[in-house]
């Protein structure tokens, strides 16, 4: 009979054992276990009846169709063959063992004790057949196996072969290399590769096959495993296998597909193709007069591109345009985009205006091209080139004048200060005191007349100021504040302000040039109550043009002792003139005590710690700050006064030899104007040079060596 | 000719603000200062301060410095004064000027709870 | 602040008759830079707003009649009124507006 045994593990027992077994009997227990497991069979007692071959009494094991081994007897002999210590192992999941014995036993027998179990396959190790093993790595697990494949790859849908992505491959560039993935080790198996060439219509693609080509092949059949096939629109070339290489493809396409088809065996390197675009060629070019063609090359194919430029000092002209470099391309018709254009010497064309200044060339034709030269110079003596440059330029290749030191910027004509046209007399006798002025003995005075219109009815008043540069003047605050409220400061608007300059006689006021203002600055600190920090600026409307009797004032170096005590100074203005006016006098005569003719005066600079005594013994709350300084003389008899207000005290320079503004007329009182002892307050402009620069918007290095010169 | 003209009289509790409007006509709003001055009943007149339209540019007295506030409408030529935390002794005629000459008609304030 | 004191505080005066007012400052209010004197004086009847008379301590305000007249500088004005008026009963202030504008208490002019 047969037995059906499913289990892991079991004990196979000969009939009645362990008493003998009885004649003339048979069994067969079918063992069968999961797939990826074998069967273990092994022995612990055997003892049957002896024969030759086994005729008689056997244990036969075996599979569907393999007899594994046939036992017999109680000892191995030549004919007969007992299990011992021997086990059995199964090739698959199937293992049949089958007991017999004879009609007749000589001997009691005991018969056998069996035991099986079932033992995991590697079968990792034991797959040969290439058909069945894995591709790239195996993985063995008890009851089965798993493979997987290295980076890059993908497992097949068979679950053992690997195989790349490689259906989205594309080249637009004009020459490029393709190769078998992988190469130059084997290609992967189970693959569909697809390779587009899409270059720019006008390209035409040419193949080359290189080095090694190895594609699996048949000998009988063409290609039936792997294979190239090259695709050129509906023409199909190919395929191709083997160990020869096809020969140059010229496709006379700017687009080509090339598919590559694995198998899912072989062992072969694989392929590599370059490629190349072919375009029509175009005529060979020459360059212009003048220039060169970049690159420069025997033969130029479509899509090729040329860069005309030019010497140095020439410049392309296409079409009556210039430009620095012209670029022109080899079309896939065969014909150039555009002709060659040809090379113009560069020309700088008529050179900037200086404001203030002239022009002079310096060669003949008065010429603007390349190389050509020029010189800048200042209207002299009024203006002077900043830094005392050479004022020398030359047409340079890019198209521009250019100045050693300045490059392309225009030379700056900086008005000259402190230099009147007529020079100050040395002896002045003793405003009030003071002496008419020569006209361009102070060309820097200027008459400031504010109509404050936002009051009703409208205030109006007048002051001096000090010419800084074409466009600003220098004065007090107090002369632009509004009047009317005295504890604040409203600066007036720039609208009620007008500015005199060149004026000689206030009855006369045609040959002076009058100015509107742009901006009226007051010094941020100025203070109402003491007149601390009694500085302003006016910005004119427009730059006023400078001349012999409007020249500006230099400004001081930053100094905070100011000048020094007892130096002399001088200061101008169109103030009363008369010390034995009164103040009531000059109300009930409105503005006739004023001076027609512009008055100047020469004072000495009182010490601080003086002038400081003198306002302290007074009566009132007077302060001389280290923003002040005073002149005058302790006798009285000259001094500056009412209407005076802004305008600027002067002491000669000796090292630039220059007039510089130290002060500014800004009060003193309560005695009238030239009262002994009552000394005139000024403000110390040399606290105040940055703060200027910084307000006109000029750096202070622009006008200091003009200064120090 | 030049013409102020204020808003109407406004009754208000103490603490409360008033806003009280001058509208200019017959000149350059913009260029003139505009005054405000009050008048308690049966009293004196009290400068407040002012405005430049223009500019903006203030001035105040003390007095009311913090309390009152002067505005000015260009596009409509008018000028505003609000006064803040009102009490019973602000209740008075407020006049807007043109610097010194032109008046407007007044607007009574009245503060009471 | 500059305080402004006017006397007398009020005034009979007969018709035709001449009328003086004085108005006194703590400060003077003569800006030196213009040479004005920023004193003005103002008209008011009951129910009506101040009227301009005089600025600039004795200019006359176009339309004022000339029997107003002022005169003055520093810190001493004078408002004079040469013939009383009926027409002319009211209450005149002074305005100082040198510094922040301060006004005199006022002095009440009515007929005797």
């Known amino acids: 009979h047969t037995v059906e045994l499913n289990n892991m593990f079991g004990q196979i027992q000969s009939p009645g054992y362990p008493d003998s077994y009885p004649s003339d009997s048979e069994v067969t227990w079918n063992i069968t276990v999961p797939d990826g497991f074998r069967i273990k069979l092994y022995f612990m007692h055997f003892n049957l009846e002896s024969s030759y071959l086994c005729e008689y009494d056997y244990v036969k094991v075996e599979t569907e169709d393999q007899v594994l081994a046939t036992f017999c007897g109680r000892e191995t002999t030549d004919t007969e063959q007992t299990p011992g210590q021997e086990v059995v192992l199964s090739p698959g999941s199937f293992m049949s063992i089958t007991f017999r014995s004879d009609f007749s036993n000589e001997e009691r027998f005991t018969g056998f004790d069996a035991h099986y179990m079932a033992v995991d396959v590697d079968e990792c190790k034991e797959r040969e057949d290439e058909e069945l093993s894995c591709d790239h790595y195996c993985h063995n697990y008890i009851g089965g196996y798993y493979c997987s494949c290295r980076f890059g790859y993908i497992l097949h849908t068979d679950n053992r072969t690997c195989r790349v992505e490689c259906s989205d491959n594309l080249f637009t560039q004009r020459t490029g290399v393709i190769t078998s993935p992988d190469f130059p080790n084997p290609y992967p198996k189970s693959s569909e590769c697809l390779y587009t060439i899409e270059l720019e219509e006008g390209f035409m693609v040419n193949l080359q096959f290189e080095d090694i080509f190895d594609i699996e092949d048949h000998p009988e059949v063409p290609c039936p495993y792997d294979y190239i096939k090259i695709k050129v629109g509906p023409k199909v070339l190919g395929p191709f296998c083997g160990e020869k290489a096809p020969e140059p493809i010229s496709t006379q396409s700017h687009s080509v597909l090339i598919l590559f088809h694995s198998d899912n065996s072989g062992e072969n390197r694989g392929w590599r193709l370059s490629y190349r675009a072919a375009g029509n060629e175009c005529p060979e070019l020459q360059p212009p007069v003048h220039g060169k063609i970049e690159p420069s090359q025997a033969k130029y194919f479509f899509k090729d591109q040329v860069l005309v430029s030019c010497d140095t000092g020439y410049k392309v002209l296409k079409d009556n345009v210039e430009m620095d470099t012209f670029q022109i391309e080899c079309l896939k018709d065969g014909t150039w985009s555009n002709k060659i254009p040809t090379c113009k010497i560069v020309d700088c064309r008529a050179p900037g205006e200086l404001e203030h200044g002239l022009i002079t060339f310096s060669t003949r034709n008065n010429l603007t091209t390349y190389k050509s030269e020029i010189k800048y110079s200042c209207q002299e003596p009024y203006y002077k080139m900043l830094n005392n440059n050479t004022g020398i330029y030359t047409c340079s290749a890019q198209g521009v004048w250019m100045n050693k030191v300045l490059g392309r910027s225009l030379p700056t004509c900086l008005p000259e200060c402190g230099q009147p046209s007529r020079s100050l007399p040395s002896l002045v006798k003793r405003i009030i005191g003071g002496r008419n002025a020569e006209p361009g003995l102070f060309p820097w005075q200027a008459l400031i007349v504010v109509e404050d219109t936002s009051r009703v009815p409208n205030d109006k008043w007048f002051g001096s100021g000090a010419l800084l540069s074409a466009s600003w003047i220098l004065t007090a605050a107090h002369v632009l504040r509004s009047q009317r409220r005295d504890t604040t400061v409203i600066p007036v608007s720039k609208e009620h302000v007008t500015v005199y300059l060149g004026l000689h006689d206030v009855r006369d006021k045609s040959g002076a040039v009058n100015s509107s203002a742009a901006r009226v600055v007051l010094h941020p600190d100025f203070n109402i109550q003491n007149y601390n920090h009694d500085i302003a600026l006016v910005q004119l409307q427009e730059p006023v043009p400078l001349g012999p009797h409007v020249m500006p004032v230099c400004l001081p170096r930053l100094e905070p002792e100011g000048p020094a005590p007892h130096m002399l100074g001088l200061v101008a203005g169109w103030g009363i003139s008369n010390p034995n006016v009164t103040v009531d006098e000059i109300i009930s005569s409105g503005t006739r005590t004023l001076s027609d003719v512009l008055q100047y005066v020469k004072l000495p600079v009182v010490p601080h710690a003086e002038c400081k005594t003198s306002y302290e013994s007074r009566s009132g709350n007077y302060s001389v700050t280290e923003n002040m300084f005073c002149a005058g003389y302790y006798e009285g008899g000259k001094d500056t006064c009412l209407g005076d207000s802004g305008g600027a005290f002067v002491i000669f320079d000796d090292l630039s030899q220059r007039w510089v503004v130290q002060g500014l007329v800004s009060w003193g009182g309560p005695e009238e104007c030239g009262s002994k002892q009552v000394y005139g307050v000024y403000t110390k402009v040399s606290n105040y040079v940055d703060w200027v620069w910084e307000q006109m918007g000029l750096p202070q290095s622009v006008v200091e060596p003009q200064v120090e010169r | 000719q030049v013409q102020l003209v204020q808003s109407g009289a406004e009754v208000k509790k103490p603490g409360a603000s008033v806003k009280v409007s001058c509208k200019a006509s017959?000149?350059?709003?913009?260029?003139?200062?505009i005054e405000w001055v009050r008048q308690a009943p049966g009293q004196g007149l009290e400068w407040i301060g002012e405005?430049?339209?223009?500019?903006?540019?203030?001035n105040y007295n003390e007095k009311f410095k913090g309390r009152a506030t002067f505005t000015a409408d260009s596009s409509t030529s008018t000028a505003y004064m609000e006064l803040s935390s009102l009490r019973s002794e602000d209740t008075a005629v407020y006049y807007c000027?043109?610097?010194?000459?032109?008046w407007g008609q007044g607007t009574l304030v009245t503060v009471s709870s | 602040d500059i305080v402004m004191t006017q006397s007398p505080d009020s005034l009979a005066v007969s018709l035709g008759e001449r009328a003086t007012i004085n108005c006194k400052s703590s400060?003077?209010?003569?800006?030196?830079?213009?040479?004005?004197?920023?004193l003005a004086w103002y008209q008011q009847k009951p129910g009506q707003p101040p009227k301009l008379l005089i600025y600039?301590?004795?200019t006359r305000e176009s339309g004022v009649p000339d029997r107003f007249s002022g005169s003055g500088s520093g810190t001493d004005f004078t408002l004079t009124i040469s013939s009383l008026q009926a027409e002319d009963v009211a209450v005149y202030y002074c305005?100082?507006?040198?510094?922040?504008?301060?006004f005199g208490q006022g002095t009440k002019v009515e007929i005797k």
């Open positions: 000027l043109r610097s010194e000459d032109v």
């Open positions: 405005i430049l339209p223009g500019t903006g540019s203030t």
């Open positions: 600039w301590a004795s």
């Open positions: 305005k100082q507006s040198y510094n922040i504008p301060t």
């Open positions: 400060q003077s209010l003569l800006q030196s830079r213009t040479r004005k004197n920023y």
């Open positions: 017959g000149y350059t709003f913009t260029g003139k200062w």
